[in-house]
């Protein structure tokens, strides 16, 4: 969470941004809010990216002005125009690329004053893992798969019964490059699993942490998975 103050004569407004992460190939949002101003025509929103000449996006006089937009963002950005008057200057970003990572500035000018705040935008790939029982194996094993990760994550296994146990000797993890030659498919197999136990497959890189749980009993298999973005807020 970054709060910036701007001073214009005696006037300043608070601009707030949130560090966030973008998933390559999907849409992302750069979050920015400011003190609302009912005079839409008096609001100017400028998004800038460190190290790039030209603007990421500009909204002024109630409409977009992309005449100064940098080439890497053409056709890929939009503000939530109907939410600008209530203080939402967030930017929607189409088809996130690895190169979109960096420091962005959300600059606001209204009839009340002006202000800006920076935002760190990380890009990578992250996805939910799915764990299945691998009945083809000679001994009962679990297969944890997640389709898209970047940078290469670490994979660790844990179990409810054997808390603190190191499963690296009885597991095998592989990373397979996807067709776009950036992201990778993660596959990890855990061997010699026992019945009536809950196992967790944890995949983590510097952007996200994902966990898949599987509970195997004689009568049923229960699964649960979750994904958490790191250092965002």
């Amino acid at each position: 969470l970054i709060i910036g103050f701007g001073i214009s004569g005696k006037h300043f407004i608070t601009v707030t941004t949130f560090t966030s992460a973008g998933n390559i190939g999907e849409d992302g949002t750069l979050s920015c809010t400011f003190e609302p101003d009912i005079k839409l025509n008096g609001i100017v929103i400028q998004w800038l990216k460190e190290g790039i000449k030209g603007l990421v996006h500009e909204f002024k006089e109630g409409k977009d002005d992309l005449s100064q937009q940098h080439e890497m963002f053409r056709g890929r950005t939009a503000v939530f125009a109907d939410q600008v008057v209530v203080g939402n200057a967030s930017l929607r970003l189409k088809n996130v690329q690895l190169t979109d990572a960096g420091t962005y500035t959300c600059y606001i000018r209204t009839s009340k004053g002006k202000g800006n705040a920076n935002l760190e935008y990380k890009t990578g790939a992250f996805s939910m893992p799915e764990i299945n029982v691998d009945y083809n194996a000679s001994s009962e094993s679990l297969r944890c798969e997640a389709p898209r990760w970047f940078p290469q994550p670490t994979v660790a296994w844990a179990s409810q019964v054997d808390q603190g146990a190191n499963f690296s000797e009885v597991s095998n993890t592989s990373f397979e490059l996807n067709s776009e030659n950036v992201t990778m498919k993660v596959v990890s197999v855990l061997y010699n699993v026992t019945i009536n136990n809950t196992y967790s497959c944890m995949i983590e890189n510097d952007i996200a942490k994902a966990t898949g749980d599987i509970k195997v009993t004689d009568s049923e298999v229960k699964r649960r998975s979750q994904l958490q973005l790191l250092n965002s807020g």
Epitope: S67, R74, G75, A78
Partner: antibody, heavy 119, light 107 residues
Framework: QIQLQQSGPGLVQPSQSLSITCTVS????????VQWIRQSPGKGLEWLGV???????DYNAAFLSRLSFSKDNSKSQVFFQMNSLQADDSAIYYC?????????????WGQGTLVTVSA | NIVMTQSPKSMSMSVGERVTLSCKAS??????VSWYQQKPEQSPKLLIY???NRYTGVPDRFTGSGSATDFTLTISSVQVEDLADYHC?????????FGSGTKLEIK
């Protein structure tokens, strides 16, 4: 009200050039890009390229060497030029505007320019 | 290039029937698929953008759904005025591409 009005010749000689003007109203060329699309019975709808608010362009690689777009923001006009036309370039040529500044669909279309390439 | 495959090529329906048109992308295009209606001698008209957003003024009998590679346009109760060609297109990556269209005829 958003409108795109096209003007240009209907008949073009083989190996000659095609020029079309798309005059827009109801929005500014500094806010939205203008797309160019053609439609022929044999190939259906084909995206040719786009000229962005900044004046930069993106072309379909299949037509890259033959296409050129430009514009005059003050006159709200976009100019299309295609060189070395052959019979299979006969089609209806459209200019269009996106629904949002993110290209999600073409909401507003010109009336089309029917182009026949024939000697 | 991403290939958009529409099916069926043509269909004949009675007024009031439910119509389902399919569009499949040769690779993932997120939700960047739009649907167009084109009547004879007219320019295409946008019905759906972003896979599921109904464009302004489009009757609510038209619904778009799908993501990644499989997309559907549904007309809940087809009307005489829906006689037209329907095209899908993707604007996820260059070059933007369109399907070959589905011709909807009314019995």
């Amino acid at each position: 009200q958003i409108q795109l009005q096209q003007s240009g010749p209907g008949l073009v000689q083989p190996s000659q050039s095609l020029s079309i003007t798309c005059t827009v109203s109801g929005f500014s060329l500094t806010s939205y890009g203008v797309q160019w699309i053609r439609q022929s019975p044999g190939k259906g709808l084909e995206w040719l390229g786009v000229i962005w608010s900044s004046g930069s362009t993106d072309y379909n690689a299949a037509f890259l060497s033959r296409l050129s777009f430009s514009k005059d923001n003050s006159k709200s006009q976009v100019f299309f030029q295609m060189n070395s036309l052959q019979a299979d370039d006969s089609a209806i040529y459209y200019c269009a505007r996106d629904v949002t500044t993110i290209v999600e669909g073409f909401a507003h279309w010109g009336q089309g320019t029917l182009v026949t390439v024939s000697a | 290039n991403i290939v958009m495959t529409q099916s069926p090529k043509s269909m004949s329906m009675s007024v009031g029937e439910r119509v389902t048109l399919s569009c499949k992308a040769s690779e993932k295009v997120g939700t960047y698929v739009s649907w167009y209606q084109q009547k004879p001698e007219q320019s295409p008209k946008l019905l759906i953008y972003g896979a599921s957003n109904r464009y302004t003024g489009v009757p609510d009998r038209f619904t778009g759904s799908g993501s990644a590679t499989d997309f559907t346009l549904t007309i809940s109760s087809v009307q005489v005025e829906d006689l037209a060609d329907y095209h899908c297109g993707q604007t996820y990556s260059y070059p933007f591409t369109f399907g070959s269209g589905t011709k909807l005829e009314i019995k």
